[in-house]
Interface confidence: low
């Protein structure tokens, strides 16, 4: 003795990414010699048993038995979203509903607002926008491995009334360490299934130079050849160097090369040397105290750096 429920078809809700394929499966225990039918949200019949009713090549029959009717819809569009109805024409007609939710895939984000010639301690503001997501996607920012805290994602409905454009801004103060860094805006959305969809903006930061004097060899001795290298860093890289020997008034201006060369060291070369590295962002002066050691083989580290 069959209960009334045995003739009640059942199905399930489905979620599909736009452009993907969804399978609608309807099953019934007791078909009472009636065929199952699928219809779309506009109440157009798609399949009645194994007979195609709607001429749409995207819709294909998967399984048709007295107890099951399964169909697939490929290249699903946002317009395909809605309630699909499985019916069995018993007395009375029984139906089951399958809610098909179509996820809109967010577009690759677009970063705008980058202004070149940022200087150290300037404030940078970047904007990021991605259209086409459904439901609305979430945007996140990072600089290298560090998360940046941007504004909360703003959401705006797209003209089609189905998908959303999301946007976010981030503001941060730049440092010299940010020169060459990539600011990345990533879109997070269930349709991406964990895949990364992001856009990066490489930033350039102009900053004042620094310099360091490096002796070669590191422990100079009387009679040796010595090079003092003034290693300037900065953006832009320092283009001008000025060497001076302290103690003489005025200080002795020696060369404008980045390296100061002593072809043959004398004790009289001992003293404090300054190198001023200059770019159009400013200047930096590095010092080095040279103590010329005797030409003995015993190493000593009497030279000092500032």
């Amino acid at each position: 003795n069959l209960s009334q429920d045995d003739s009640q078809p059942w199905t399930s809700d489905e979620t599909v990414v736009a452009g993907g394929t969804v399978v609608l499966k309807c099953q019934v225990k007791d078909h009472e010699d009636s065929s199952l039918q699928w219809s779309n949200p506009a109440q157009q019949t798609l399949y009645f048993g194994e007979k195609r009713a709607l001429r749409d090549n995207r819709i294909q029959l998967v399984t048709s038995t007295p107890h099951e009717l399964s169909i697939s819809i490929s290249n699903v569009a946002l317009a395909d979203e809605g309630e699909y109805t499985c019916s069995i024409f018993t007395m009375p007609v029984r139906t089951a509903k399958s809610l098909v939710t179509v996820l809109g895939i967010p577009q690759k984000p677009i970063i705008t607002g980058y202004k070149s010639s940022l200087r150290e301690k300037d404030t940078a503001t970047l904007n990021c926008q991605s259209s086409g997501s459904k439901p609305a996607a979430r945007l996140t920012w990072r600089k290298g491995d560090q998360e940046l805290h941007g504004e909360p994602t703003r959401i705006q409905e797209d003209p089609n009334g189905k998908t959303f454009t999301v946007s976010s801004s981030v503001t941060f103060q730049v440092t010299r360490e940010d020169d060459g860094a990539s600011i990345v805006c990533s879109v997070n959305h269930e349709s991406l299934k964990g895949a990364d969809r992001s856009t990066s903006q490489r930033i350039e930061v102009l900053y004042t130079p620094t310099a360091m004097i490096r002796p070669d060899p590191p422990h100079p001795r009387e009679g040796q050849k010595l090079l003092l290298h003034c290693e300037g860093r900065g953006n832009p890289v320092p283009q001008q160097y000025l060497w001076e020997k302290e103690g003489s008034v005025p200080p002795l201006k020696m060369t404008q090369e980045s390296a100061l060369i002593f072809p043959f060291l004398n004790k009289s070369d001992s003293g404090t040397y300054g190198c001023t590295a200059t770019s159009n962002m400013g200047s930096y002066k590095a010092y080095y105290t040279l103590n010329v050691n005797d030409p003995s083989p015993v190493p000593s580290s009497s030279s000092t750096y500032h």
């Epitope: 990414v17 736009a18 452009g19 993907g20 290249n75 699903v76 569009a77 946002l78 809109g104 895939i105 577009q107 690759k108 259209s131 086409g132 797209d158 003209p159 089609n160 189905k162 998908t163």
Partner: nanobody, 124 residues
Framework: QVQLVQSGGGLVQPGGSLRLSCAAS????????RGWVRQAPGKGLEWVSA????????NYADSAKGRFTISRDNSKNTLYLQMNSLRAEDTAVYYC?????????????????WGQGTLVTVSS
């Protein structure tokens, strides 16, 4: 890796013509519809035109009808947009784009990969 590389923008006088190109790599070009989307200064994205995978079906926004022609050469994996009778309001960054699905996308949504954009300036 999907890449769309654009060329052909620039400055043109009102009434003049330009041809934009978009070379594709990293996917089977002939399997997918393609489209052009533009963004005028200070405005949102506006769909311009689309073409199906074979080139047999095309569609245009009202603002482009009769002046713009979309075409594709599947042997060269390249999409084109021929723009004639250009007007000042056509000034925008033009993006070529690949829809997420194989069906043409008649709107600015539904595209998953974008070219780098090319600026078209119409000014006298």
């Amino acid at each position: 890796q999907v890449q769309l590389v654009q060329s052909g923008g620039g400055l043109v006088q009102p009434g003049g013509s330009l041809r934009l190109s978009c070379a594709a790599s990293g996917f089977t070009f002939s399997n997918y519809a393609r489209g052009w989307v533009r963004q005028a200064p200070g405005k949102g994205l506006e769909w311009v035109s689309a073409i199906d995978y074979s080139g047999g079906s095309t569609n245009y926004a009202d603002s482009a009808k009769g002046r713009f022609t979309i075409s594709r050469d599947n042997s060269k994996n390249t999409l084109y947009l021929q723009m004639n009778s250009l007007r000042a309001e056509d000034t925008a960054v033009y993006y070529c784009a690949k829809p997420a699905s194989r069906r043409p996308s008649w709107d600015a949504d539904g595209y998953d990969y974008w070219g780098q954009g090319t600026l078209v300036t119409v000014s006298s």
